[in-house]
């Protein structure tokens, strides 16, 4: 994304649909700041590097975050 996070919110639209953790390249959780008042969750997909903004309030997305953090804790020693 050309513009840096310090200027404005990254996400202008959001999705309630969860993504398959296996198709995720990266999952960024950006906390609120003076430039953006809410948490932003940005999923970068393996295919084409497509970015998808996820709704932090969605139950499905909350479940996705739990699944991803569980996966990470399994991997870490």
């Amino acid at each position: 994304i050309p513009l840096s996070r310090t200027v404005r919110c990254t996400c202008i639209s959001i999705s309630n649909q969860p993504v398959n953790p296996r198709s995720l390249e990266k999952l960024e959780i950006i906390p609120p700041s003076q430039f953006c008042p809410h948490v932003e969750i940005i999923a970068t997909m393996k295919k084409k590097g497509e970015k998808r903004c996820l709704n932090p309030e969605s139950k499905a997305i909350k479940n996705l975050l739990k699944a991803v953090s569980k996966e990470r804790s399994k991997r870490s020693p």
Epitope: P2, C11, I12, S15, N16, C36, H38, K51, C53, N55
Partner: antibody, heavy 122, light 108 residues
Framework: QVQLVESGGGVVQPGRSLRLSCAAS????????MHWVRQAPGKGLEWVAL????????YYADSVKGRFTISRDNSKNTLYLQMNSLRAEDTAVYYC???????????????WGQGILVTVSS | EIVLTQSPATLSLSPGERATLSCRAS??????LAWYQQKPGQAPRLLIY???NRATGIPARFSGSGSGTDFTLTISSLEPEDFAVYYC??????????FGQGTKLEIK
């Protein structure tokens, strides 16, 4: 199916105000960024304004900055464009459009209303 | 503000022929470019996004290519319903989102 229906257009004198509405259905309006785009008679497309899903930031073309205000009511699934200090050069068909991407860079305007004519004339 | 220049202004072709429309940006827009089709009295319709991805429901005869400053919309074999005005739009440096001036594709 996705539907966007504009209303509120008409003939108005220079210097006066008008408010356009765009009623949305068939998608989760509160999750979607929305735009206004206009087209003067016989001319090309001109982007007017953008409002993100939460209404926190708003963005405008220089030609309307300080005169037009974009807003939304997510409880009513409605987008608005308040147009003040209207000029003859604001005469155009005004379209509301849904943002199909998430960041404003990816995607495009994937659904459009049918358009509403605003004529500014004395 | 990024300026988009479309060429040619008018393209006269017959059904079944291949159409090649060009859009040039005044500075790099990476692959953040979209193409729209507009028929008289109708709203524009999204054809291509991110320079080369077909929007939902768009026939395979439409394809987009390019990155940086030079982009092309190709219609492989023209159907009667393809005669319309085509606009490119840059999404790299906003606000503002800017459109090209349009290419009119007319029946020869």
């Amino acid at each position: 199916q996705v539907q966007l229906v504009e209303s509120g257009g008409g003939v108005v004198q220079p210097g006066r105000s008008l408010r356009l509405s765009c009623a949305a259905s068939g998608f989760t309006f509160s999750n979607s960024a929305m735009h206004w785009v206009r087209q003067a008679p016989g001319k090309g497309l001109e982007w007017v304004a953008l409002i993100p899903f939460d209404g926190y930031n708003k963005y405008y073309a220089d030609s309307v900055k300080g005169r037009f205000t974009i807003s939304r009511d997510n409880s009513k699934n409605t987008l608005y464009l308040q147009m003040n200090s209207l000029r003859a050069e604001d005469t155009a068909v005004y379209y509301c459009a849904r943002e199909g991407g998430y960041t404003g860079y990816d995607g495009g305007f994937d659904y459009w209303g049918q358009g509403i004519l605003v004529t500014v004339s004395s | 503000e990024i300026v988009l220049t479309q060429s040619p202004a008018t393209l006269s072709l017959s059904p079944g022929e291949r159409a090649t429309l060009s859009c040039r940006a005044s500075q790099s827009v990476s692959s953040y470019l979209a193409w729209y089709q507009q028929k008289p009295g109708q709203a524009p319709r999204l054809l291509i996004y991110d320079a080369s991805n077909r929007a939902t429901g768009i026939p395979a005869r439409f394809s987009g290519s390019g990155s940086g400053t030079d982009f092309t919309l190709t219609i492989s074999s023209l159907e009667p319903e393809d005669f319309a005005v085509y606009y490119c739009q840059q999404r790299s440096n906003w606000p503002p989102y800017t459109f090209g001036q349009g290419t009119k594709l007319e029946i020869k």
